[in-house]
């Protein structure tokens, strides 16, 4: 990487290196030969998360309830607010600017991973021996009924959407 004129946590201004402001503070005035960099803390609704020379702090993110958002972690002078989604919703992006309802797994599919505030439902096809006959955001694929354990026989084969149908054993020879 190219050479730099200053130390780490400094910046070059007027041919002189000045200290950057620490996280949580903004720049008021550059240093001079005789004075240090002047910095001021960010207000309660603002933050700066790096060593910086910003003259304005960034506003904390607003978790808009109209978009299904709620506060997961309140911001500080050094960190932004973290939003998450209300129950039954998940973020549309990593920055979580809006929420959409969790999807349901259609019949023939089961829930592999239940949705969270930041991730959608993950569905998987029901393998042979399993089925799902409902549209659900929670239900896993269920195993076919075992007719043998009930002393019954399979009368109708199961599918990925239907259970087997059991019936009595045929006594005729």
């Amino acid at each position: 990487e190219p050479p730099t004129a200053c130390r780490e946590k400094q910046y070059l201004i007027n041919s002189q290196c000045c200290s950057l402001c620490q996280p949580g503070q903004k720049l008021v005035s550059d240093c001079t030969e005789f004075t240090e960099t002047e910095c001021l803390p960010c207000s309660e609704s603002e933050f700066l998360d790096t060593w910086n020379r910003e003259t304005r702090c960034h506003q904390h993110k607003y978790c808009d309830p109209n978009l299904g958002l709620q506060v997961q972690q309140k911001g500080t002078s050094e960190t932004d607010t973290i939003c998450t989604c209300e129950e039954g919703l998940h973020c549309t992006s990593e920055s979580c600017e809006s929420c959409v309802p969790h999807r349901s797994c259609l019949p023939g599919f089961g829930v592999k991973q239940i949705a969270t505030g930041v991730s959608d439902t993950i569905c998987e096809p029901c393998p042979v021996g399993f089925f799902s006959n409902v549209s659900s955001a929670f239900e896993k694929c269920r195993p076919w009924t075992s007719c043998e354990t009930k002393d019954l026989v399979v009368q109708q084969a199961g599918t990925n959407k239907t259970d087997v149908v059991c019936g009595p054993q045929d006594r005729q020879r």
Epitope: A5, C6, R7, Q10, L12, Q16, C18, S19, E33, T37
Partner: antibody, heavy 126, light 107 residues
């Protein structure tokens, strides 16, 4: 007391590499930048660059960019300077030098060297 | 890069003499300047920093002055152990640069 002890003299062929070590004692190694300065026979002092032993961050003089690598091992309080593709005009005494403490400086880089290693003579000759 | 020009390159003086060495920067460096003394076969030794602050343990016959581009190192009364080469160094921005040196020799 503060001491910087460097590795011994080296004789290298042109095109080879050399790695010089600088073992620090008597102070908190990670609290001060370490610089490397060289001096060709009968010549003046030439700054090569620095390493921040705390972060591992480095800054090299343009002249040595791409040829020099400064590293450190905090577990043994030792800084290293490796110079590649050696030429005959790299023949010099190489010094490590301790800077002022981190956070000492608010304006300027104020890099003044209060402690120096004893120097390592690197001779490049075919 | 900031060029540091020292003068004279050498000076012959006697014990007890007052010796003055000057250093000029190619651009303003405020007071970010150091002076070093180096004896043959030895590492440099810090004498003065921030143009005029005497390093701990350095005799008071050494003094520094100046600001901006022009700086001076003065040895008020030269002692036998002061015969050496002296270097100035700017500490305003990287890359750090040194003057070419001034050799103080016995007359």
């Amino acid at each position: 007391q503060v001491q910087l002890v460097q590795s011994g003299a080296e004789v290298k062929k042109p095109g080879a590499s050399v790695k010089v070590s600088c073992k620090a004692s008597g102070y908190t190694f990670t609290g001060y930048y370490m610089h490397w300065v060289r001096q060709a026979p009968g010549q003046g002092l030439e700054w090569m660059g620095w390493i921040n032993p705390d972060s591992g961050g480095t800054n090299y003089a343009q002249k040595f960019q791409g040829r020099v690598t400064m590293t450190r091992d905090t577990s043994i309080s030792t800084a290293y300077m490796e110079l590649n593709r050696l030429r005959s005009d790299d023949t010099a005494v190489y010094y490590c030098a301790r800077d002022q403490p981190l956070g000492y400086c608010t304006n300027g880089v104020c890099s003044y060297f209060d402690y120096w290693g004893q120097g390592t003579l690197v001779t490049v000759s075919s | 890069d900031i060029q540091m020009t020292q003068s004279p390159s050498s000076v012959s003086a006697s014990v007890g003499d007052r010796v003055t060495i000057t250093c000029r920067a190619s651009q303003g460096i405020y007071s970010w300047l150091a002076w070093y003394q180096q004896k043959p076969g030895k590492a440099p030794n810090l004498l003065i920093y921030t143009a005029s602050t005497l390093q701990s343990g350095v005799p008071s016959r050494f003094s520094g002055s100046g600001s901006g581009t022009d700086f001076t190192l003065t040895i008020s009364s030269l002692q036998p152990e002061d015969f050496a080469t002296y270097y100035c160094q700017q500490a305003n921005i990287f890359p750090l640069t040194f003057g070419g040196g001034t050799k103080v020799e016995i007359k």
